[in-house]
Every structure is written in C-alpha cells, then in structure tokens.
Interface confidence: low
C-alpha cells in the first residue's frame, strides 16, 4: 500500500500524486521553500535550537556557522545554549544548574481558562495530558531526554541512563564502542563520582585501551567488544 509524500517543489501536487497512486496515499508536501530549517551538524545553523543535543550554534566572525560540542563546567560561554545539559551560563562561565531547578515534576499539560484581553472571549481549554483533579488517574510518564533530571535509569529514554552530575542526576547517553568509560574498582564506587558516566552499551565492556601511542600510566578505559 502506498502513501506518497510528494514535494510541492517537484511540480506535482499531493493531490495529483494521489490520483495516480494505487492503494492508500498519504500526501505529505514539503514547504515551497528550499530554505527550510533542517537538522544535524552537517548543516549551517542560525540558532542553538537547530543543533543536536549537546551542541550549540557557533557563529564565527568569518566563515559559516556550525553546530559545535557544548561547553562543560568552568568553560567560557556567552549564553546558556553554549553550556552542556545540567549547566548554564553565568558571568561568562558554565556553572551547574542548582538542584532545585532540576527537581523532577509529575508530568502534566493542564488546560486553563484564559481571557483574551483584546476581545473579551473566554476559552476553556482542556489540553491536559492528565486531569489534575483526579490524583489517582493513570498518568503517562515522560521519559527524560539528554540532560533532563531523573531519579533512576528507567526515567530516561532508551539509550540513556540516569547518572550523577554534580549533586543532581540527569539522563546521559549510554557509551558506545570506542568511548571513554569508567572502570569500577570497587563495588558501589559510582557513588563517589561527581560526573558519573553511563555503562557501556550491550555487548561492550569497559577495558583498558591497549595502544602503544598512549601512556601506559594513564590506563585509559574505553568501551570494547566483549
């Protein structure tokens, strides 16, 4: 069965496409401008919001703007968007967001009765994900994304774990092959880390990186295939 996403750029409208397609047809037309805002660091950016998680839009005086890796704690910054999840820009330096700001909330999207001041029209909008008036009603749990506050790893979306970041806990990405990891020397030593890392992804283990070009004293650990 066919659902066609035809572009209005291509000269054929979704309706025309539907007429010649057999079965089910979902016409999904792109906008008429090729200057739409797209995603990913391969593209120039105009704001931080166009970059992937953990990146910000760097606009040099000369050359094109691009999504750059976020700045960590104590690094220089000009705005909040430059700082990594769990930190914010204060007096030109990325500092940790306070615990109170990162406290998890019960998810909700409430409806409110709002009066339009210009026209005096009342609108009673029930746009809620839940009804707060019924505390025992079943509530959907919003899974945390990168940098979101959490209590345990089940609070985070797949591919992320709940790890300590200063004195709070946020969702961080599970480590992939070749990424630096933390080898646990003693059981429960995770509790001592201010910047806790996630474990390696399934099928990987945290092993010493045996590389002649790297100092043996450093004993860098990376995620490697079991």
């Amino acid at each position: 069965k066919l659902n066609s996403i035809k572009s209005s750029l291509g000269g054929e409208t979704p309706a025309q496409s539907a007429n010649r397609s057999a079965g089910m047809n979902q016409g999904l037309a792109f906008g008429g401008s090729k200057k739409g805002k797209s995603l990913g660091q391969a593209y120039p950016c105009s704001s931080d919001k166009e970059c992937e998680v953990g990146r910000y839009c760097h606009s040099p005086h000369q050359g094109s703007s691009a999504c750059m890796l976020c700045r960590r704690k104590k690094k220089r910054c000009h705005r909040d968007g430059m700082c990594c999840p769990g930190t914010r820009c204060n007096n030109g330096i990325c500092i940790p967001v306070t615990e109170s700001i990162l406290t998890p909330h019960i998810p909700a999207l409430d409806g409110t009765r709002h009066r339009d001041r210009n026209h005096g029209h009342y609108s009673n909008h029930d746009l809620g994900w839940q009804n707060l008036g019924r505390p025992h009603s079943k509530m959907p749990h919003i899974k945390g994304h990168e940098g979101d506050p959490c209590l345990r790893s089940s609070d985070c979306i797949d591919g992320f774990c709940c790890a300590r970041h200063f004195w709070t806990k946020i969702c961080k990405p599970v480590l992939h092959q070749g990424e630096v990891c933390t080898k646990q020397r003693k059981k429960g030593s995770h509790g001592l880390e201010i910047f806790q890392r996630c474990d390696c992804a399934k099928g990987l283990s945290c092993k010493v990186w045996k590389d002649a070009t790297y100092s043996s004293k450093a004993r860098l650990h990376v995620c490697q295939k079991i």
Epitope: I5, S7, L9, L28, A29, F30, G31, G36, K37, S38, L39, G40, Q41, A42, Y43, S47, K49, E50, C51, E52, V53, D80, G81, P104, H105, I106, P107, A108, L109, W129, P140, I142, G144, H145, E146, G147, D148, I157, G159, F160, P173
Partner: antibody
C-alpha cells in the same frame, strides 16, 4: 474542551506544560479539521520566543509563551468557518537527538466558528 | 483519507514516499515519524527516526525504510489498532504530515 467563537472575534488558546524543562523544547501547534489530516501551524521555543510559522498561517496565528507559568498560547485572529477545527499543542521530541517529531500531545480544543 | 479493512491477526503495511530524502548524512538518521490517532483522541507517536519505536509501543509496530521510501508494518493487527495513521517528516520546517490511512 469545546469553544464556540463568533466570526471575527479572536480567540486565544492556552497550553500549560509541566514535568519537563519547558524552556528546552519547541512547542508545536497542530490543526485538524473534522475527518481530515493534521496540519502544522507553527512552533515556538520558550527560551527566547523564537517562532517558526507555516506560511499558510502567518496572518492567522500568533504564538506566545509565558515562561513563568510554563504556558504556551496561540491566538487566532479574525476567525472564519475555515478555522473551525481541533487544535493541539504538542511538544517537540528531543529523542536523544534534536528532532521535530512530537512525543507528547495535549488533548486538543475543538473550536467552532459560528454566529 | 484512504481506508483499509483488516481482520485481527493480519499483517498490515502502510507506505510513505517522499520526493526529498529525509536522511541526515551526518548521523545516518532518517527523520520520518509515524503517529496513531484513535477516534476522539490525540495523535500518539509510534515510531521516529523511521525505525525507532517509541517507549511503550507494542513491538508489532515496525517502522522501516530510508531516504525517500518508508513503511509502517503492523505484524499482527489487533482490534485496538483500529485508528488513523499518519506519517510526518520531522527533518525540516515547515513540518508536514501525510493525509492519513484509516485502518478499519
């Protein structure tokens, strides 16, 4: 909920969010006419109120936010029968990477424009 | 929207074709999402990045495809799957949805 709006009298829809960092995610507004598909109106980023509107709605919809109450608003100007629809607010889903998919939706408000 | 009558247990396939690639070469992700909307309810995200199932979505919903051709498969349709299904490109603004497929 349901709303009856007089033609020409603007209406402001509100969408209150909690349970996540309101200023980190785009908030989308989507229109659905009876028995029809979904139409993206636009989105606003609460951090700085940057707005991206579907050109079709540039003279129809005005998106605003109130960071202090974690509430997004959409005002529809000079409503006509063509604006009779269900309007949803929907959160941008970060989903690990920056993405414009929508992972949480409001329950929708049915707006009927009639005299 | 087009509709399709199905029986419980049957395999359902819906396709979505784009005239522009939705593949982001920098991360090899296809920015195509699928939503389910039951009568009188809000849409629900089923699949994003073409094949990643949203948390809590039954594994009978399988998204596939790359570039311009995408498919949502329900491997064994259940009575509760009767709904409208929409595809959406979540790559570039303005965001756009498919016209929808009604599963009856």
């Amino acid at each position: 909920g349901a709303e009856l709006v007089r033609p020409g009298a603007s209406v402001k829809l509100s969408c209150k969010a909690s349970g996540y960092s309101f200023t980190n995610y785009w908030m989308n507004w989507v229109k659905q006419r009876p028995g029809q598909g979904l139409e993206w109106i636009g989105m606003i980023h609460p951090s700085d109120s940057e707005t991206r509107l579907n050109q079709k709605f540039k003279d129809k919809a005005t998106l605003t936010v109130d960071k202090s109450s974690s509430t997004a608003y959409m005002q529809l100007s000079s409503p006509t029968s063509e604006d009779s629809a269900v309007y949803y607010c929907a959160r941008e889903g970060r989903l690990g990477l920056r993405s414009y998919a929508m992972d949480y939706w409001g329950q929708g408000t049915s707006v009927t424009v009639s005299s | 929207p087009s509709s399709l009558a199905m029986s419980v247990g049957q395999k359902v396939t819906m396709s979505c074709k784009s005239s522009q690639s939705l593949l982001n070469s920098s991360n090899q992700k296809n920015y195509l999402a699928w939503y389910q909307q039951k009568p009188g309810q809000s849409p629900k995200l089923l699949v994003y990045f073409a094949s990643t199932r949203e948390s809590g979505v039954p594994d009978r919903f399988v998204g596939s495809g790359s570039g311009t051709d995408f498919t949502l498969t329900i491997t064994s349709v259940q009575a509760e799957d009767l709904a409208d299904y929409f595809c959406q490109q979540h790559y570039i603004t303005p965001l756009t949805f498919g016209a929808g497929t009604k599963l009856e």
